[in-house]
């Protein structure tokens, strides 16, 4: 079925929501005055060998889990991330997105990287699909 | 019951080489980073570095880059701290510790019994 | 790196005393509102252990008569009444920035 211009404006919508939550969690934690970011540091993520469909959203997914448990070093009583909210919000936006019709086995990269690359790696990902729907 | 145990003493001569380990027990290894803290003989705590055992990932105290090397092994749940060329100011007391980050908290909670190391001529 | 200087360095005192010992950092240990100072006791040969964490937690098991306070480049760590086994020496450490640093130690002894 081709898109139409109602499920294309959807589609943007909830990309930029994505990018949104995932800038918000980067300018959180990519402070360098963050006590905790050489340790958040030391966590590893799987980045996508190939990123450029939304089906390749399925790579994000898998790494949610790991991405909450580094965020819930990110807490502080002025800074309210509530990293189960947040990453349950990501991950509705995500099912959406790569819709749950099709199974796409992710492939990864052989290099692990942190967290600022890995949320970078999708923030670039994010603006560059909107970008191909403006 | 929650423990970090580190291997025994240890009297080496300068320019030998050394790896002393701290095994945990009672809680998923893996999920907390290990750090090493160095205490010299009369004196104060100095921290030296940390490792996250499940992914390996390092930091280490810039006085100490390039002098020690911080590894872990996640299958047997211990951490190593390593010389390859052992000075007579490395003689000291080395503890592990776990480090406790979640919430607004960043602490140590459980230490090892150290592991005292004596480098003499 | 951020100093931490702790007074007196040793002192004498006798059991049921009110013991209190500062730390003055060289610069604030706060981040967004929370104070990234905990204390740690030593007795000699053995390992530190955790007594507070974040300026005024009291850590698990740790007796109520151990208290801190403090924020920003102040902090005290106070004993409301010396027991026999407290007599020890007392850190404080910031884990506000790397590298984290300790305070040269408070060696409390029996008078």
């Known amino acids: 079925m081709a898109p139409t211009s109602s499920s294309t404006k959807k589609t943007q919508l909830q990309l930029e929501h994505l990018l949104l939550d995932l800038q918000m969690i980067l300018n959180g934690i990519n402070n360098y005055k963050n006590p905790k970011l050489t340790r958040m540091l030391t966590f590893k993520f799987y980045m996508p060998k190939k990123a450029t469909e939304l089906k390749h959203l399925q790579c994000l997914e898998e790494e949610l889990k790991p991405l909450e448990e580094v965020l819930n070093l990110a807490q502080s009583k002025n800074f309210h991330l509530r990293p189960r909210d947040l990453i349950s919000n990501i991950n509705v936006i995500v099912l959406e997105l790569k819709g749950s019709e099709t199974t796409f086995m992710c492939e990864y990269a052989d290099e692990t990287a942190t967290i600022v690359e890995f949320l970078n790696r999708w923030i670039t990902f994010s603006q560059s699909i909107i970008s191909t729907l403006t | 019951e929650v423990q970090l145990v580190q291997s025994g003493a240890e009297v080496k001569k300068p320019g030998e080489s050394l790896k002393i380990s701290c095994k945990g027990s009672?809680?998923?290894?893996?999920?907390?980073?290990i750090e090493w803290v160095r205490q010299m003989p009369g004196k104060g705590l100095e921290w030296m570095g940390v490792?996250?055992?499940?992914?390996?990932?390092?930091y280490y105290n810039e006085k100490f880059k390039g002098q020690v090397t911080i590894s872990a092994d996640k299958s047997i749940s211990t951490a190593y701290l390593q010389w390859s060329s052992l000075k007579a100011s490395d003689t000291a007391m080395y503890y592990c510790?776990?480090?406790?980050?979640?919430?607004?908290?960043?602490?140590?909670?459980?230490w090892g019994q150290g592991t005292t190391v004596t480098v003499s001529s | 790196a951020i100093r931490l200087t702790q007074s007196p360095s040793s002192f004498s005192a006798s059991t049921g005393d009110r013991v209190t010992i500062t730390c003055k950092a060289s610069?604030?240990?706060?981040?967004?509102?929370?104070?990234?100072m905990n204390w740690y006791q030593q007795k000699p040969g053995k390992a530190p252990k955790l007594l507070i964490y974040?300026?005024?937690n009291l850590e698990s098991g740790v007796p109520s008569r151990f208290s801190g306070s403090g924020s920003g480049t102040d902090f005290t760590l106070t004993i409301s009444s010396l027991q026999s086994e407290d007599f020890a020496t007392y850190y404080c450490?910031?884990?506000?920035?790397?590298?984290?640093?300790f305070g040269g130690g408070t060696k409390v002894e029996i008078k």
């Open positions: 610069q604030s240990v706060d981040y967004q509102g929370d104070s990234y």
């Open positions: 450490q910031q884990s506000n920035e790397d590298p984290y640093t």
């Open positions: 490792i996250n055992p499940g992914s390996g990932g390092t």
């Open positions: 974040a300026a005024s």
């Open positions: 510790a776990r480090w406790r980050g979640e919430g607004y908290y960043a602490y140590y909670d459980v």
């Open positions: 009672g809680y998923a290894f893996s999920n907390y980073l």
